[in-house]
Amino acid sequence: EVEKTACPSGKKAREIDESLIFYKKWELEACVDAALLATQMDRVNAIPFTYEQLDVLKHKLDELYPQGYPESVIQHLGYLFLKMSPEDIRKWNVTSLETLKALLEVNKGHEMSPQVATLIDRFVKGRGQLDKDTLDTLTAFYPGYLCSLSPEELSSVPPSSIWAVRPQDLDTCDPRQLDVLYPKARLAFQNMNGSEYFVKIQSFLGGAPTEDLKALSQQNVSMDLATFMKLRTDAVLPLTVAEVQKLLGPHVEGLKAEERHRPVRDWILRQRQDDLDTLGLGLQGGIPNGYLVLDLSMQEALS
């Protein structure tokens, strides 16, 4: 807190300009009118105020707007944004994407701070859903943003927004998140032809059910092993050897290197050894010839 003192004669600020960088904190407090500051916020970023002087400017704005800053001020905060607490930001009503971009730019190159997380939360809640332009903006600044949302939050993402998602945006998503995103992606890309569709849907396949994988196996997609290894185990298990061979195409040879890892390991255990041998990869661990396979899960479902 800066104690209230009278402004020295001749030092009253008529405008926000560079002469103020030589003012002591108490002089800034006494000589700069908060309303003037609010109307000339766009000048603040062009002036090299010290970190301590920024504290005073924030204090003045806080006094002027105890219920939260108006967007006209927020969009010009610049580096002053880093002085804000999540509590300050919760009072704001940010509706403009340009304002959001301006503030994210300030934090560019750094990890998502509590301030930024609060800002994004306020913005998205204000919009009611995570629309394409917002998602585009957020993933451009924070590629991992999408995977930081809960499945419940992801359910508010409209399928049209999925077009903004890049493969790297999904790198840290877990299966529960992909379960939510996959149906949206399927819907978003449904009008694309086979090969183009596969390119777009590939990153989301960690949420795909068995029947969709079976359908893909009929389309000569040549799925790479990295994508196959991210598929849901429960979706892979019912696939036949022939279906996996068609799904992977020339990449099927990579199964040998992954035979001890899920989902390949679990899939091998479910296949007849005879069928595995047809691949010529030396995969071991299948069901020996002459054994009868009882699907107990099916049995339970029938009883």
Partner: nanobody, 120 residues
Framework: EVQVVESGGGLVQAGGSLRLSCVPS????????MGWYRQALGPERELVAA???????YYANPVKGRFTIYRDNDKNTLYLQMNNLKPEDTAMYYC??????????????WGQGTQVTVSS
């Protein structure tokens, strides 16, 4: 407290150029504000140019349009590019981080400085 080492001064003819360098003890990318001061005759050091991570810059009136302050994070260096030098630019130049404000009285971390002499 940030310690600094300045270099790049020298003797140059009027109209010539020099580039001063300042290497801080810490990572320059995390130092919010840095500036260049100079001291000619007399005890007072005047702020020549200042810059903050927020993008704000300041140039004293006598050097506007001739001097440029900038950082290179990769080289961890603050520079002062001085073009079209004049005899009145002759001074000892110091790099510093400000205290509460940019007045020289508030700076505590002065380096040894680098001498610039401009002959006519």
């Amino acid at each position: 407290e940030v310690q600094v080492v300045e270099s790049g001064g020298g003797l140059v003819q009027a109209g010539g150029s020099l580039r001063l360098s300042c290497v801080p003890s810490g990572s320059i990318s995390s130092i919010y504000a840095m500036g260049w001061y100079r001291q000619a005759l007399g005890p007072e050091r005047e702020l020549v140019a200042a810059q903050t991570l927020g993008g704000g810059t300041y140039y004293a009136n006598p050097v506007k349009g001739r001097f440029t302050i900038y950082r290179d994070n990769d080289k961890n260096t603050l520079y002062l590019q001085m073009n079209n030098l004049k005899p009145e630019d002759t001074a000892m130049y110091y790099c510093a981080t400000p205290g509460e404000h940019w007045g020289s009285s508030d700076v505590t971390n002065w380096g040894q400085g680098t001498q610039v002499t401009v002959s006519s």
